[in-house]
């Protein structure tokens, strides 16, 4: 039975040209996290394999950085980066857990950021 839950940064906003950290945290399960994938709509941005490390898609390597932790940093944001992002936790034996984050990239210099997210 899948007992885990994913906490995410939720709905966040950031300024055009700036950067943002996407964070998810899996809790309430003893399942082994074997890999975390980060996706934007239907595109795979990055893979973090628990043993074999981070791998950033060539399409995004100039604007995506691994971490902190299992999170993902998006840089040089454009309005086209607005949309849904998903963290997909592959675990054993539970299976797959998915978290959703909505990012809005604003032209304004007064972008309000969501509450700071910290992994306990």
């Amino acid at each position: 039975m899948m007992t885990g839950t994913i906490e995410t940064t939720g709905n966040i906003s950031a300024e055009k040209g700036g950067s943002i950290i996407l964070q998810c945290h899996l809790s309430s399960t003893t399942a082994q996290v074997t890999q975390v994938n980060w996706e934007q709509q239907d595109q795979l941005l990055a893979i973090c394999n628990a043993d074999l490390g981070w791998h950033i898609s060539p399409s995004f390597k100039d604007r995506v950085a691994p971490g902190p932790g299992l999170g993902l940093t998006l840089q040089s944001l454009t309005v086209n980066d607005t949309g849904e992002y998903f963290c997909i936790y592959h675990t054993y034996p539970d299976g797959t857990y998915t978290g959703r984050i909505f990012l809005e990239v604003l032209e304004s210099s007064v972008a309000e950021h969501g509450a700071r997210f910290q992994i306990p």
Partner: antibody, heavy 119, light 107 residues
Framework: QVQLQESGGELGKPGGSLRLSCAAS????????MSWVRQAPGKGLELVAT????????YYPDSVKGRFTISRDNSKNTLYLQMDSLRAEDTAVYYC????????????WGQGTLVTVSS | DIQMTQSPSTLSAFVGDTITITCKAS??????VSWYQQKPGQPPKLLIY???TRHTGVPDRFSGSGSGTDYTLTISSLQAEDVAVYYC?????????FGQGTKVDIK
């Protein structure tokens, strides 16, 4: 240049044990996760174990979970695969492999060592 | 586990031909696919990763493409030294699984 050299492959009996070794050179071994991949005679490839750079995290598919143990000694630049409760279907060439730097694919492979399980 | 099904299982073509090997995943693997070449008695050699990025030193007659569940390896102007078994591998989900292989030879 990166070099990986497996050893320890031999004839094992069903229910028995074997330990494979992979000596690594030409790179900072302690900075890389490593893997074992096997290939049964005339068959395809199967990833059977992975381990992170410091040995603190490991992964096994269901086919070998509970029977195989991957480990490493970074002071000796050596990767190991302890194979217990051997079965006939474990007969294969066993390769140690490393991903390329920034490459989502196994760019470096040893020459392999043959394990034969038979009574 | 994600199954990777390659077709055809064997392929015979003339030197200079363009050939295509297909790999179909049992679910969307979002371009997390690599391709390998294995010659008899040798370990596999990485050709392509992230579906279409050629590995260092790989001749440009080898190319990869695809998305979703369907991926292809194309060898243009097939050479005698390309005789080998070719494997795809997905990295989208653990365990990272391989296709069963496609054997390529020369007519």
């Amino acid at each position: 240049q990166v070099q990986l050299q497996e050893s320890g492959g031999e004839l094992g009996k069903p229910g028995g044990s074997l330990r494979l070794s992979c000596a690594a050179s030409g790179f900072t071994f302690s900075s890389y996760g490593m893997s074992w991949v096997r290939q049964a005679p005339g068959k395809g490839l199967e990833l059977v174990a992975t381990i992170n750079s410091n040995g603190g995290s490991t992964y096994y598919p269901d086919s070998v979970k509970g029977r195989f143990t991957i480990s490493r000694d970074n002071s000796k630049n050596t990767l190991y695969l302890q194979m217990d409760s051997l079965r006939a279907e474990d007969t294969a060439v066993y390769y140690c492999a490393r991903l390329g730097t920034g490459t989502l694919g196994f760019a470096y492979w040893g020459q392999g060592t043959l394990v034969t399980v038979s009574s | 586990d994600i199954q990777m099904t390659q077709s055809p299982s064997t392929l015979s073509a003339f030197v200079g031909d363009t050939i295509t090997i297909t790999c179909k995943a049992s679910q969307d693997v979002k371009t997390a696919v690599s391709w390998y070449q294995q010659k008899p008695g040798q370990p596999p050699k990485l050709l392509i990763y992230w579906a279409s990025t050629r590995h260092t030193g790989v001749p440009d007659r080898f190319s990869g493409s695809g998305s979703g569940t369907d991926y292809t390896l194309t060898i243009s102007s097939l050479q005698a030294e390309d005789v080998a078994v070719y494997y795809c591998q997905q990295h989208y989900s653990t365990p990272w699984t391989f296709g069963q292989g496609t054997k390529v030879d020369i007519k």
